[in-house]
């Protein structure tokens, strides 16, 4: 049997040590034990006696079926404690009595069918995070449960099986900053959503299937909901039951953020939101992001048109990753305060985003994003693009360019744009020359001479350079980032004649470590305030007997460098 | 540049099963979806189906649901697609094509032709 | 399914005249804005190859004599002027709707 291997802080490291039983010889001077993926089975009431010190347990995934009533009687300190995907059938309240300074706390994952017959954490006043739950047994929430918590940050409940829900066990929690909730089914989810109105403030629902979710209204007088975000992970909707779950917003007032993550959409996006009020009450809400959407049908979705109005207010809006090949020219000119737009991993091509980005479309959109999609002429975005009067940031990067012409039409006030894995070889003057940042990053490029008076920041690490670009080119250049490239030198001239640069990274590069480098970077002390990643990223290239050293470290012999 | 490389030739016995390869090469594989059409001798084109190597979701048309299994293997970008049950209607060119746009494709294998035979 | 009927089956034309293909679809293959219409050439023992997409976007590399038009169910393409090069299969295709149809191919031939 292998031992533990602890540092001079007191952080013990036994994980995956096939032990069978807590090891022997645990110290007052240990601070934090991991024990996970054993096959402990048991802690008896002395195994851990003389941790007295000990701030971190966790014993993860270790086969654990048993342990004494007492077995942490003597953490006290104990801040961290994680039995996650054990074995416990059963928790006991006496467990948590001893252990008054936890902040963390994780059940998950153990064949408990309920958290026990009486509560178990009413000693645990400074607890911040619990996990509880698992998949297959946890069935019923009690309102014993969370008798004496009564502010958490996060709580995860993982109730997959979920029989029973006693009306207002939740309720007693008067502060959740952040509730995750795994519910295979709606079916107690309105009882549970009238508990935590007035405690939680960001309400994450993970797994649900939703599609035959029903709305009734609440039991609650007028609450002043906290709620300010609202998150669906993996949760399987249809119009119908999107136009429920709309119904709910008039409970939350003040809700600014809207999420779907991995979620399924059973529909055609025929959205019918039968209430006026829905539409006024989602007001508030100014940030939507959407991932990974599956549309089964998604030829036939509908153009939202449904939904306009719902939307005229929001300013954020992210579509990633959800096989959008068009947004349908009316939906683009109702998002009228719409600042932000990303539409990274989608089909787009220039040919159907001109129907997107039509006359009137996003009048105050400022930053655009296209990352990954289907675009394949620069020419022909910088031209589709000129309906955004107010657009100063654009990323397209990671899509296949043709090669670049010499001249684009760009937005006008455009500032900022990335360029970087396109794949392009040569930079021309169809970049505009408004840009204060450009991003060329990951690309091809073997040098870079384009004149940009107003350019502050420029992202060119992973290209082939072989020399700093020449300084002339940016009189007010701020910053600079040049790594892995094969730039082989710098000099006093070089970095002296950029004015204004404040920040050069051109690390990783092929240093040609000669006496002049060398020299240089050792008169030059101050270079560790301009390079962000001195010294351990420039090493010498060559000569040979150099190789591998770092330039801050490597002294030019004497002979070569006083011929 | 971009190249969509499909398996040779196959003569196959009824009832048989085939698997074609289509290797992609020139372009990131999993930002795009592939696609697969059938020629019969001196016919038509007719779409088979679809995937998206990034999800691996499947789209098919329902006259090859039960014929065709399409997969893809990202590390190595490329598509396969299998066919069961083969009978001499199944002799035909099998095309792979790589979808833009989400609605049109762009770029085609050079097609593998199966021959059902005994 | 929406069936694409291309018409004519095989059109004879002069070299360095017009050539006009048709193609109708059964229901419209408008999708808010844009025609999800695709017209494909096939020259004999090799794939084939797109010439238009959305009804009338040339692809890149396609020579300027190509066109298409068209919106709703009608569809055209055109060739003008027609080369030697350009005697062979044209085939359109709808992505309005699953499953993706084919039309049926007209064959150029020269008068």
């Known amino acids: 049997q292998e031992s533990l291997s602890c540092d001079a802080s007191g952080v013990c490291d036994g994980r995956s040590r096939s032990f069978t039983s807590i090891p022997s010889g645990l110290t007052a001077a240990m601070k934090s034990l991991d024990l996970s993926f054993n096959k402990i089975t048991y802690i008896g009431h002395g195994d851990l006696r003389a941790c007295a010190n000990l701030q971190v347990l966790i014993l993860k995934s270790s086969r654990i079926n048993t342990i004494e009533g007492d077995a942490f009687y003597s953490l006290g300190s104990l801040e961290h404690l994680d039995l996650s995907d054990n074995h416990l059938s059963s928790l006991s309240s006496s467990w948590f009595g001893p252990l008054s300074s936890l902040k963390y706390l994780n059940l998950m994952g153990n064949p408990y069918q309920t958290l026990g017959v009486t509560s178990l954490f009413p000693n645990l006043t400074n607890l911040q995070t619990l996990r509880i739950g698992n998949v297959e047994t946890f069935s019923e929430i009690r309102r014993i449960d969370f008798a004496g918590l009564t502010s958490l940050n996060e709580l995860e409940i993982k109730a997959l099986s979920l029989r029973n829900y006693q009306s207002q066990s939740l309720k007693s929690i008067r502060d959740i900053h952040h509730l995750t909730l795994h519910l295979s089914e709606s079916a107690f989810l309105l009882e549970i959503f009238a508990d935590i109105l007035s405690s939680v403030r960001y309400l994450e629902l993970r797994d649900t299937n939703l599609a035959r979710f029903q709305f009734s209204p609440l039991p609650v007088d007028e609450v002043s909901s906290p709620m300010k975000k609202l998150a669906f992970r993996g949760s399987v909707l249809t119009d119908e039951s999107f136009n429920e779950l709309l119904k709910l917003l008039r409970y939350i007032l003040e809700l600014s953020e809207v999420e779907f993550d991995d979620c399924t959409l059973n529909g055609l996006g025929d959205f019918n939101p039968s209430e006026s009020d829905v539409v006024s009450e989602l007001g508030k809400v100014e940030t939507v992001t959407i991932r990974r959407l599956h549309i089964p049908q998604f030829y036939l979705f509908y153009d939202l048109s449904t939904v306009y109005s719902l939307l005229e207010k929001v300013k954020r809006i992210t579509v990633e990753n959800s096989k959008v090949f068009l947004v349908p020219c009316s939906f683009s000119q109702h998002l009228k305060s719409l600042e932000f737009l990303d539409l990274s991993e989608n089909l787009m091509v220039e040919e159907y985003l001109k129907n997107s980005a039509c006359k009137g479309a996003w009048p105050s959109l400022q930053t655009l994003v296209l990352s990954q999609n289907h675009l394949r002429s620069m020419q022909k975005t910088g031209e589709i693009l000129l309906t955004l009067k107010n657009l100063t940031s654009l990323d397209i990067s990671r899509n296949t360019f043709h090669p670049m012409p010499d001249s684009c039409q760009w937005p006008e006030k455009m500032r900022f744009l990335n360029l970087s894995s396109t794949g392009i070889r040569v930079v021309k003057t169809c970049i505009p020359q408004t840009l204060e940042v450009l991003d060329v990053s990951n690309n091809n490029l073997d040098s870079f001479s384009l004149f940009l008076p107003r350019l502050q920041e420029l992202y060119i690490s992973r290209n082939k350079l072989k020399t700093l670009p020449d300084a002339s080119l940016f009189p007010v250049l701020l910053v600079m980032k040049i790594r892995e490239n094969a730039v082989s030198t710098f000099s006093k001239d070089q970095l002296g004649s950029f004015p204004k640069l404040e920040t050069l990274e051109a690390g990783d590069n092929h240093f040609v470590c000669s006496c002049e480098l060398l020299s240089f970077t050792m008169e030059t002390p101050a270079l560790a305030q301009i390079l962000v990643d001195w010294p351990d990223s420039y090493l010498c290239d060559s000569p040979p007997r150099l190789h591998g050293h770092r330039l801050q470290d490597a002294r030019p012999s004497v002979l070569e460098c006083h011929q | 540049q971009v190249q969509l490389q499909q398996s040779g030739p196959e003569l196959v016995n009824p009832g048989a099963s085939v698997k074609l390869s289509c290797k992609a090469s020139?372009?990131?594989?999993?930002?795009?979806?592939i696609n697969w059409v059938k020629q019969g001798p001196g016919q038509g084109l007719e779409w088979i189906g679809w995937i998206y190597p990034r999800d691996g979701s499947t789209n098919f048309n329902e006259n090859f649901k039960d014929k065709a299994a399409l997969t893809v293997d990202t590390s190595s970008s490329t598509a396969y697609m299998e066919l069961h049950s083969l009978t001499s209607e199944d002799s035909a060119v099998y095309f792979c094509a790589r979808l833009t746009g989400g609605t049109f494709l762009d770029y085609w294998g050079q097609g593998t032709t199966v021959t059902v035979s005994s | 399914d929406i069936e694409l009927t291309q018409s004519p089956a095989s059109l004879a034309v002069s070299l360095g005249q017009r050539a006009t293909i048709s193609c109708r679809a059964s229901?419209?293959?408008?999708?808010?804005?844009?025609?999800?219409m695709q017209w494909y050439q096939q020259k004999p023992g090799q794939p084939p190859k797109l010439l238009i997409f959305g009804a009338s976007n040339v692809e890149s590399g396609v020579p300027v004599r190509f066109s298409g038009s068209g919106s709703g169910t009608d569809f055209s393409l055109n060739i003008h002027p027609v080369e030697e090069d350009d005697i062979v299969m044209y085939f359109c295709?709808?992505?309005?709707?699953?499953?993706?149809?084919f039309g049926g191919g007209t064959k150029l031939e020269i008068k």
């Open positions: 229901e419209s293959v408008e999708y808010y804005g844009t025609s999800l």
């Open positions: 295709q709808q992505s309005r709707k699953l499953p993706w149809t």
């Open positions: 020139g372009f990131t594989f999993t930002t795009y979806g």
